[in-house]
């Protein structure tokens, strides 16, 4: 059929909860292409009707929710003007009672459900939530050994659980829970994460490099909306926290009441030798009190700030 078979991806998934997979393969999907999903080499594409339990949503295939019988090989076909590529995705659905103590450990989960914390360091766990824009995600709750996590060593920040001064007792089975809303219906997402510990330095002694900001000022009009990216390069197996702070406080905490200034969701691009991370800060409305205040982007031991300043008056 003239289509290029690219790769096979294996995913282990939990039954009875939503799952989505995005058909992206840069640079192929960055141009003008059409994406169509199929199941088990069927000639009939997956439905695009949003009421269907399994449907295609733009480049995504979305299961609301995943069921036992959904295991199988799915193909997404990427057609460009002069090209055709096919990605094979092998989905295996398992039944797992997260709090069933008679079942030791989890099945052979994909790597994002196995995470490592570094002893004695400030570290974090990530709740991997890959869903299309049509899915609205509520706040994340974190559990360890089936008990909701509390205590001042733990902070929930976007999709991450920050753990300060990691100890040996922090190892074990975790879960992150979130309510997903799609077309008015609510679904529970519960991701189990096995967390192990190590004393080894996660980044081999190298430090993350903040590409931007550069301890610089930005001219911005009072009352405007402003988004500033913090761009960071770091080694691939780093465990550094990346965040924006003001007055030594996470911006989301500092502006907890007004939510006028917020930290965005971290994204990253993977290169051969390093990862490039981006985490932005959004000022919904710049106020006088923001001028002259250093807004610090932190990445592990590295930090850099931006400072807002009023534009110079135009005397023309």
């Amino acid at each position: 059929d003239g289509c290029n078979d690219i790769f096979m991806k294996n995913e282990m998934l939990s039954a009875s909860q939503p799952f989505a997979f995005n058909c992206t393969f840069p640079p192929i999907t960055s141009g003008e292409v059409s994406v169509t999903w199929y199941k088990n080499s069927s000639k009939i594409p997956v439905s695009k009707i949003i009421q269907s339990r399994i449907h295609q949503d733009e480049t995504w295939i979305l299961f609301l929710p995943m069921e036992w019988g959904d295991s199988g090989v799915y193909q997404c076909v990427i057609k460009g003007r002069d090209s055709c590529h096919r990605i094979h995705v092998n989905l295996t659905v398992f039944e797992k009672q997260w709090c069933d103590t008679s079942v030791k450990g989890l099945p052979n989960l994909s790597d994002e459900y196995k995470q490592i914390l570094h002893l004695g360091k400030d570290d974090s766990l990530t709740c991997h939530l890959h869903f299309p824009k049509s899915c609205i995600l509520g706040p994340i709750k974190w559990y360890k050994d089936c008990n909701e996590i509390t205590g001042e060593r733990f902070t929930v920040l976007e999709t991450r659980l920050l753990v300060s001064n990691v100890s040996a007792e922090d190892r074990g089975n975790y879960a992150c829970q979130v309510i997903l809303t799609h077309s008015g219906k609510q679904y529970e997402v519960l991701n189990g994460i096995t967390v192990s510990i190590t004393e080894r330095a996660g980044y081999g002694g190298s430090v993350p490099k903040i590409i931007y900001p550069k301890n610089n000022s930005i001219e911005v009009q009072l009352g405007t909306t402003l988004i500033v990216d913090c761009n960071i390069t770091d080694t691939k197996d780093n465990t550094n926290l990346r965040c924006w702070r003001v007055n030594n406080t996470l911006v989301d905490d500092y502006y907890n009441e007004s939510k006028r200034i917020r930290e965005g969701v971290e994204t990253h691009a993977s290169f051969r030798e390093y990862n490039l991370y981006t985490v932005n800060i959004t000022f919904l409305e710049v106020k006088m009190e923001d001028y002259g205040l250093p807004f610090m982007c932190h990445a592990g031991v590295s930090a850099a700030y931006i400072m807002l300043q009023l534009p110079a008056p135009d005397f023309r």
């Epitope: 074990g172 192990s196 510990i197 190590t198 080894r200 080694t235 197996d237």
Partner: antibody, heavy 120, light 106 residues
């Protein structure tokens, strides 16, 4: 059950490169830390280095100029290369990994070891 | 580098004896790991995170210590305990082993 198996030539000539393979079953080398350790005859254990889940490598500084650890995730194998070998590199070479009781540094799973003799 | 010095280097003891092996680190380490090795065999994880016994290790073994001084103790030596024991640290690279303590039958 995690199993590791070393393979490679048992005899290497001086100044040549020692090459060993560790084949892993029961676990993915894209999780955790994958170590090489050696045991000189009649002497103690020496830590050589590791390759991590992301492909990051760490080498013991005493061997750093001569050692390379790499991997092939499609084969679930990782490798040790030690260049410019001398008789002092004669040892039993082990691959090992941790993760026991969620402790990556607790090296619970070991290969059976392979004796490499450096001799002309 | 953190030097790990085990004492004694070798030890002759009898079945039923209480035996203590010491591992001294040249700088503070957070946790100690102990391995048992028998001739011609791969080492076995014996004690991890200073005081936790690995699966299958008899309760007559115990581990303790902090900072620079750690011990492995056998409360009542049994015939199958005769082997070489190594301590190891992962706190600071390079990740060093002790030179080993060979436990022999008197």
């Amino acid at each position: 059950q995690v199993q590791l198996q070393e393979s490679g030539p048992g005899l290497v000539k001086p100044s040549q490169t020692l090459s060993l393979t560790c084949t892993v079953s029961g676990a993915s080398i894209t999780s955790g830390y994958w170590n090489w350790i050696r045991n000189h005859p009649g002497k103690g254990l020496e830590y050589i280095g590791y390759i991590s889940y992301s492909g990051y490598t760490y080498y013991n500084p005493s061997l750093k100029s001569r050692v390379t650890i790499s991997r092939d995730t499609s084969k679930n194998q990782y490798y040790l290369k030690l260049s410019s070998v001398t008789a002092a590199d004669t040892a039993v070479y082990y691959c090992a990994t941790g993760g026991y009781d969620y402790v990556e540094d607790a090296l619970y799973y070991w290969g059976q070891g392979t004796l490499v003799t450096v001799s002309s | 580098d953190i030097q790990m010095t085990q004492s004694p280097s070798s030890l002759s003891a009898s079945v039923g004896d209480r035996v203590t092996i010491t591992c001294r680190a040249s700088s503070n380490v957070r946790y100690m790991y102990w391995y048992q090795q028998k001739p011609g065999k791969a080492p076995k994880l014996w004690i991890y995170l200073t005081s936790n016994l690995a699966s299958g290790v008899p309760s007559r073994f115990s581990g303790s210590g902090s900072g620079t001084s750690y011990t492995l103790t056998i409360s009542s030596l049994q015939p199958e305990d005769f082997a070489t024991y190594y301590c190891q640290q992962f706190t600071t690279s390079p990740y060093t082993f002790g030179q080993g303590t060979k436990l022999e039958i008197k």
